[in-house]
Each structure stands twice: as C-alpha cells, then as structure tokens.
C-alpha cells in the first residue's frame, strides 16, 4: 500500500497533549524510532509524568482515505463495556504549508489529531519544491511555531553590510519566484531557500534539509545546505551553508529583519530576533483577548462584537463581506454557517460562502502585529478552507465610537485580508517576560 501523504514521510512529527503532559511521536509512513514503543509503532505516546511509553498506532495496521489516516493496535481498551482496540485517528485538511499535527483529544480508546497541510490539498498550488517541519517543542513541551513566517511567494532580504551582494532567504521552504515582477530575485535557482545575488547572477547557497531545531528555550536553529555537487568558484573549495538562528526577544518589541552575523567561505550565519521564536502561548489566544502574566500585554477586542444580528460590512469589488468578530452571533446572510466572516457575491446574493468560522478563531500578537484569524470556512476548489486574516492598527480617534470598521484589502488563494483601525487595538504593555 503506497504512502498516502509522501511529502510527510521523511520526518517523525511531534504533537503534545499539554493538559495531560503527553508527547506523541508520529511517523505516518514507517515507524517511529523508539524502542519502548516496539518496532512497528507509527504513533508513540510518551507519558512524561510516569516516564512510560505506549504505542497507540501500529504502522502495519494503517487504513487511509484522502482525508483520514487511522492506525489501529492490537491493544484492547474498555469503552462502555465493549471490547475495542486502541487507535490513533489523524484528520487531514488542506493547508498552505506542511503544517503541524495538532492533538485534539483522547478517549480511552482513540487518540485524535488534526493536520492542516499542503499534502492534503486537491491541487498542488501550495506545494513547495522542498519544505521541512517548521515547529519544535521545547523541554517544557511548549510549542514554537515558525509556520507564520513561511513565505509562499517571495523572500526576506537579509541585512548585510556588503553593497555588492544581496542574500535572500525563506523560512523552512524554498523561495518561490513565480510571481516576481522582474527583480533580481527572478534569477534564483529553483529549490533554493537561501539565494545569493551578485549583480545579474544568482546562486543557490542553501536548501532546507532538516527540520527546525531548538538549541535553548528561546533559540531555534534552521540549517540549509547546498545539495548540488560542484563548488561555487567564490567559496574557496567549501560547500555553501546557511544557519539561521531565531531568537525570542526578552521583552515585547516590533519585528526586526534577519541580520547576517558572520560569513566565511560561503558559510552564512544569520540571526533573526522575532517573537515567532517564542512559545506559541506567548503569542496567541483562542479568545479575543490576550492578557496576563504569560503574554506581557493587555489586549481586548471583545467590545468589537456586534449584537442584535448586525454586522460590519466591508466592500470587496465583486463581493460584500459581512463580519461579526469576537462572538457567536450568526450573520443573517450566512445560512447558519457559524461564520465570523461571510462572503456574498454582489451580482448573485444567493452565492454565500463562509470565509472563516467563529469557533475557529486565533488572536495573535507578534512582532508588533495584531492579527485576528478565522479559518475553517467553506472549501475552495483546491480543497483549502477559506480563511480571513484581519490586521488591526491602533487608532485612538477611530470613528464608530472608537470601534472603527474593517476594510477589505485583498484575497490570495482563498485567504481574505482586512485591515481594521480601532482604539481597541491599542496594546498595553507589561514588562516581565
């Protein structure tokens, strides 16, 4: 039986049940390399409290559909008096990166995971030439996730004092230049995640090979190497390599750009101070507020919720968008879709799509950007579920009693972008991270 998601096969993935202090190792094509779980375990559960291991999914007992992977075991479990077997169930959804398996819940018998990944899309539009896992768990089982930094198109410029060269990088995946409007970047070879441009020539100085690593709680490392044989003539016989160290800052700050800290014989060392390197709970909330000791800030967008069936309306050329954020009020037009953002076609108002649902909500404050994300909307033809990204700006003089109003700024591959100036986006900082 062929592997259902070949691009996920090269790695052993991790997921965590934080509530119960459980670390899962998942290998969807082969077996995890953990002796205590046996030679054929595809899903190995490590109970950290008791320091014990149990296989909760056997690679031999795999069954797959396009969107669901199940690993059974021969271990019995008691569920309401019936004799079941322990199993793991992974639901796959289309995503724009390789993504990460997320632990959902566990019963006596079944361990449930959800995974938004390019591997599950109906079309290949989001697939990279080369991409590696872009998250890690630290020793305290806190997740550090750089997926939001991955550029699907284009690159980041590395700050470097050399006026004759430009070093471009992407995070965890190769640089896609298909949409380049005709700049230097277009010359970058396919597959490169680190591209050095000198004049009109571009060189591959690194491709992703291994996933993100954690070196210390607040320092993550990504290494790129040039896979191709044949040395570059300006590298003094060495093979090019790039090491990017992502550093979580000691207190809240605006984002900085990646900086070249050392360069010798085509070995490039880059340091990037970014809050995305911090653990995810420092950056994100499932509610509309971020506050408390853990986050170093006080943000509360709940006053933006609309009551009594009214919604914010944003005009988007062919479509009208109805938004009702930070609540669970149904948008009237949206046919009980539980939508926080609803897209209605102007020329045919019966064409209604959920562009993100209110129970799939993430509030993120990172590198000075405050963003509210709604995902899990109606599917596009690629299989990707529509989502909305609302970028907030502090405006103490916003109209509508300080609430302001969302402005549609564009759509890219079924992700809808809005900006929203409001006094409720004015962030209050604490200082004790």
């Amino acid at each position: 039986q062929a592997a259902p998601f070949p691009e996920l096969c090269s790695y052993t993935w991790e997921a965590v049940d934080t509530k119960n202090n459980v670390l899962y190792k998942i290998n969807i094509c082969g077996s995890v390399d953990i002796v205590q779980c046996g030679p054929s375990s595809a899903v190995c559960m490590h109970l950290l409290k008791t320091r014990t291991y149990h296989s909760v999914g056997d690679s031999v007992l795999r069954s797959a559909t396009r969107s669901l992977l199940e690993f059974n075991t021969t271990v019995s479990c008691d569920q309401q008096g019936t004799n079941h077997r322990v199993q793991s169930s992974i639901a796959f959804l289309c995503g724009k990166t390789l993504g990460t398996p997320e632990f959902v819940t566990a019963t006596e018998c079944v361990h449930y995971f959800e995974w938004r990944t390019t591997a599950a899309c109906k079309k290949d539009i989001f697939k990279a030439n080369k991409e590696v896992p872009c998250y890690v768990f630290d020793e305290e089982l806190r997740k550090h996730d750089l997926n939001p930094l991955i550029k699907l198109s284009g690159a980041y410029l590395v700050d470097d004092s050399d006026p004759d060269t430009s070093l471009f990088i992407n995070v965890c995946r190769d640089i896609d230049t298909l949409r380049d409007p005709g700049s230097q970047l277009r010359a970058c070879p396919p597959g490169t995640a680190a591209c050095l441009v000198r004049g009109h020539q571009a060189f591959d100085v690194g491709q992703p090979r291994d996933g993100l690593k954690v070196v210390r709680k607040d320092r993550l490392v990504l290494s790129y190497v040039r896979e191709e044989a044949g040395k570059l003539d300006f590298c003094d016989g060495h093979s090019p390599a790039v090491t990017i160290t992502f550093v979580c800052p000691s207190e809240r700050r605006e984002g900085t750009i990646p900086k070249l800290t050392a360069k010798s014989n085509c070995r490039y060392e880059i340091e990037w101070i970014t809050e995305y390197a911090c653990h995810r709970d420092y950056l994100e909330s499932k509610t509309c507020s971020l506050s408390g000791e853990q986050q170093d800030v006080s943000i509360d967008l709940t006053p933006l919720a609309q009551s009594g069936g009214s919604s914010y309306i944003s005009d988007g050329k062919e479509y009208l968008f109805y938004l009702n954020v930070c609540g669970e009020t149904e948008i009237q037009f949206c046919n009980k879709k539980q939508a926080a953002v609803c897209q209605v076609k102007k020329s045919d108002t019966s064409q209604v799509k959920a562009a993100g649902r209110y129970h799939n909500q993430t509030l993120r404050y990172s590198d000075g950007d405050l963003t509210l994300i709604y995902f899990g909307g109606d599917e596009c033809s690629s299989g990707f579920q529509r989502m909305s990204v609302i970028n907030f700006e502090c405006n103490k003089t916003a109209g509508n009693d300080g609430k302001g109003t969302p402005v549609f700024t564009g759509e890219v591959d079924c992700t809808y972008f809005f900006t929203w100036d409001t006094e409720y986006a004015c962030v209050h900082h604490h200082h004790h991270h």
Partner: nanobody, 123 residues
Amino acid sequence: DVQLVESGGGLVQPGGSLRLSCAASGRTFNTYNWGWFRQAPGKEREFVAAIRWSSSKTSYADSVKGRFTISRDNAKNTIYLQMNSLRPEDTAVYYCAASIVDFTTNPSHFGSWGQGTLVTVSS
C-alpha cells in the same frame, strides 16, 4: 508581469502639495509589496516609501518622513503618494514598483517599473 502607470506629477511651488497615483494591472495586485522611488537628474534612483501588501505597514526614507504618505486602494488597484510641504530637493522623476521581497528598500529588488512622472518643485 504587472503593468504600472504613474500619474499626478507637475510643477508646484515650495511648501505645496501633490498626490501621485500608480495604477496597476496584470497579475495579482495583492501579493506584492509596493514602493515609490525617485531619480533626480544625474543621481541614482532612491527609495522614497513602501507599503506591505498584507498589513498596510509602511516605511519611509528619512528625508520624506512626516511629509509624504503612501497608501493604496485595493478596489482600484492603485497606489498613492501624498506629498506635502514639498521642497526644491524633492524635484525628480517618481516611479512606483512592485516587489515580492520583504524588508527591502533596494530598487534592484523591485520590478515592473512604470515610465515615471516628473515632479518639479520651484518658485
């Protein structure tokens, strides 16, 4: 590629204002960072202002901070440069351009240059 057409230039007195427009057509407007650049006679092309595609975050050259404002109207696929308190040293041909590179002000990282629009500040 993206096609760009700048307009709105002209002769203006010192201390006056102008609003430049840049109309974009072609591929997806939304995936680009947009920049305004200028080139005075006999000088290199220099960065003026930029706007990030997804969040409308802006950056400016020190020489224009507080006087110039970059903005965009996605419904019209148009980028604007509002120029106030103009000075004689602002005289140049102004260009808009698109980039898929984040954190850059380097003209060589932008493409799809328009023909430019001439701004002359003189009494």
